[in-house]
């Protein structure tokens, strides 16, 4: 519609009490340069006066020549394309609608931007890939819908409460499209990380805790096995009995099949967690292991070298 002023800015901005809000904004007036600008809080049109009522947070004809360090609300724009705003500090009662009342020589426009200010710092959000497999590098993302030039923050990664050694890459966006702070951590999880708690902690510039988000790692991995043999030294005489037991210490997802291998070859009809060898013969000497599979793949135990000696 050619009869409209054109604005670009994030639809909603988020902050918390005492922080600040930086509102990237561009515009194009319908005709010529802007003559005046008023920033309203929760503006309401008054039909009787044909004007907007509401708290005036900034008035170009007044605040434009007040030293900027004295102003909580600053218009950082100009009279033809930039309508960027800053509120520092921002307060809980600033929540609501900001109304940008723009007037050129012959045209007027009211542009609305939503501001959501919480009482306390809101938590970031951890994003994980849909599936995490052991030893495969993944990127953990921590996203916070906040960034402001006057209020530096940091995002720190913790694993079971301990800072993670891997280097994280933090990026910020303060554009008309989006305002956020993001931290990305490349990480190769081991099976032992399954079930562990990862935390993304929001801190102020001094490292003071503000808020956090936590997730429990779901690391897909092949079954992890332990093999036990009786006798424990796996040295027997012909005619003796040997018992081998396979224990699953971890499997994600659950295991589906069990088998035993001798010298890399599957032993037929041995599909339980216990392998009983009775009255062993010399040719039963060799390397034994158990193999347990799940949807990720097969897991093998360490090999046990069974030595059958002459009686």
């Amino acid at each position: 519609d050619s009869s409209k002023w054109v604005f670009e800015h994030p639809e909603t901005l988020y902050a918390w009490e005492g922080a600040c809000v930086w509102i990237p904004c561009t515009y194009r007036a319908l005709d010529g340069d802007l003559e005046s600008f008023i920033l309203f809080h929760n503006p309401e049109y008054n039909k009787n006066t044909s004007k907007f009522d509401g708290t005036r947070l900034y008035e170009s004809t007044k605040d434009g020549k007040v030293p900027s360090e004295q102003k909580r609300v600053q218009f950082l724009g100009d009279k033809n394309k930039n309508c960027t705003l800053s509120i520092h500090p921002v307060h809980l009662n600033d929540s609501g609608q900001l109304g940008l009342r723009m007037e050129s020589k012959t045209e007027k426009w009211m542009e609305r931007i939503h501001l959501n200010v919480s009482e306390r710092p809101f938590p970031p959000h951890i994003q994980l890939p849909p599936e995490i497999q052991e030893s495969q590098e993944v990127t953990l993302t921590c996203l916070l819908n906040f960034s402001c030039y006057g209020y530096p923050i940091q995002l720190q990664w913790l694993l079971e409460g301990v800072p993670m050694r891997q280097a994280a890459v933090t990026s910020t966006s303060l554009t008309i499209k989006s305002v956020f702070t993001r931290s990305e951590l490349k990480f190769s999880p081991q099976w032992s990380h399954h079930g562990k708690i990862v935390t993304c902690q929001l801190q102020d510039a001094d490292g003071k805790f503000l808020s956090n988000d936590t997730v429990q790692l779901n690391v897909k991995h092949t079954p992890k096995l332990e093999i036990k043999v009786t006798p424990s030294d796996a040295i027997v005489r012909e005619g003796d009995s040997v018992t081998m037991t396979c224990e699953v210490s971890s499997s994600n997802p659950e295991y589906t099949t069990v088998s035993w291998l001798k010298d890399g070859t599957s032993l037929k009809k041995q599909n339980t967690f216990t392998l009983n060898l009775r009255e062993v013969t010399k040719d039963q000497s060799g390397k034994y292991c158990c193999q347990v599979s799940n949807d990720v793949g097969p897991g093998r135990s360490e090999e046990v070298f069974l030595q059958v000696q002459y009686a």
Epitope: L34, F37, T61, K62, K65, D78
Partner: antibody, heavy 120, light 112 residues
């Protein structure tokens, strides 16, 4: 047409008080800073202070704080300069001048001035 | 307070002459928003001042092109490229960047 008309000047004794008026017309009075500037006979210009009629915010030159008070009545589109404890050195022509731009800031419109003479 | 010092205090010139008036501030007059609110005003006897130049170098509407302003930081200049009969007056620089706002003491341009 934007116009500023000062009034209220005259002869006053040392220690006395005087209130000057600046009647504005031709623009939205509440939304421009109004300044007071004075000029002693044969001397240069001196900024006294300013007011934003929309909310009554003021700034003063330190020299005049306490003795001079600037106010405004938006219903009458008039700014005032209340001068107390006047001295001989306050003898001057007093001008009101509008800060006329949202962006560039300058005194674009001046009143014709009103003479204040402090003498016994 | 910021002192604005103009030189010369007075000068004599003829019609057609190029005239330069300088104004020096006792400290930088860059406003916290990055602008420099340095203005030049012309005043004739018995009249109110008139704006010539704002923000160092911008000519106010209706001001003839022979008037120009330049400078930065603490040193500023008003130039009249070719003096006309109606230009004989007193000229004041003014800083509106920091409180209290201050004027220079004035430069009187007289007919030689």
């Amino acid at each position: 047409e934007v116009q500023l008309v000062e009034s209220g000047g005259g002869l006053v004794q040392p220690g006395g008080s005087l209130r000057l008026s600046c009647a504005a017309s031709g623009y939205e009075f509440s939304r421009s800073w109004m300044n007071w500037v004075r000029q002693a006979p044969g001397k240069g210009l001196e900024w006294v202070g300013r007011i934003y009629p929309g909310d009554g915010d003021t700034n003063y030159s330190g020299k005049f704080k306490g003795r001079f008070t600037i106010s405004a009545d938006t219903s009458k589109n008039t700014a005032y300069l209340q001068m107390n404890s006047l001295r001989a050195e306050d003898t001057a022509v007093y001008y009101c001048a509008r800060d006329g731009s949202s962006w560039d800031w300058y005194f674009d419109v001046w009143g014709q001035g009103t003479l204040v003479t402090v003498s016994s | 307070d910021i002192q604005m010092t103009q030189s010369p205090s007075s000068l004599s010139a003829s019609v057609g002459d190029r005239v330069t008036i300088t104004c020096r501030s006792s400290q930088s007059i860059v406003h916290s928003d990055g602008n420099t609110f340095l203005e030049w005003y012309q005043q004739k006897p018995g009249k109110a001042p008139k704006l010539l130049i704002y923000k160092v170098s911008n000519r106010f509407s209706g001001v003839p092109s022979r008037f120009s302003g330049s400078g930065s930081g603490t040193d500023f200049t008003l130039t009249i490229s070719s003096l006309q009969p109606e230009d004989f007056a007193t000229y004041y620089c003014f800083q509106g960047s920091q409180f209290p706002y201050t004027f220079g003491q004035g430069t009187k341009v007289e007919i030689k």
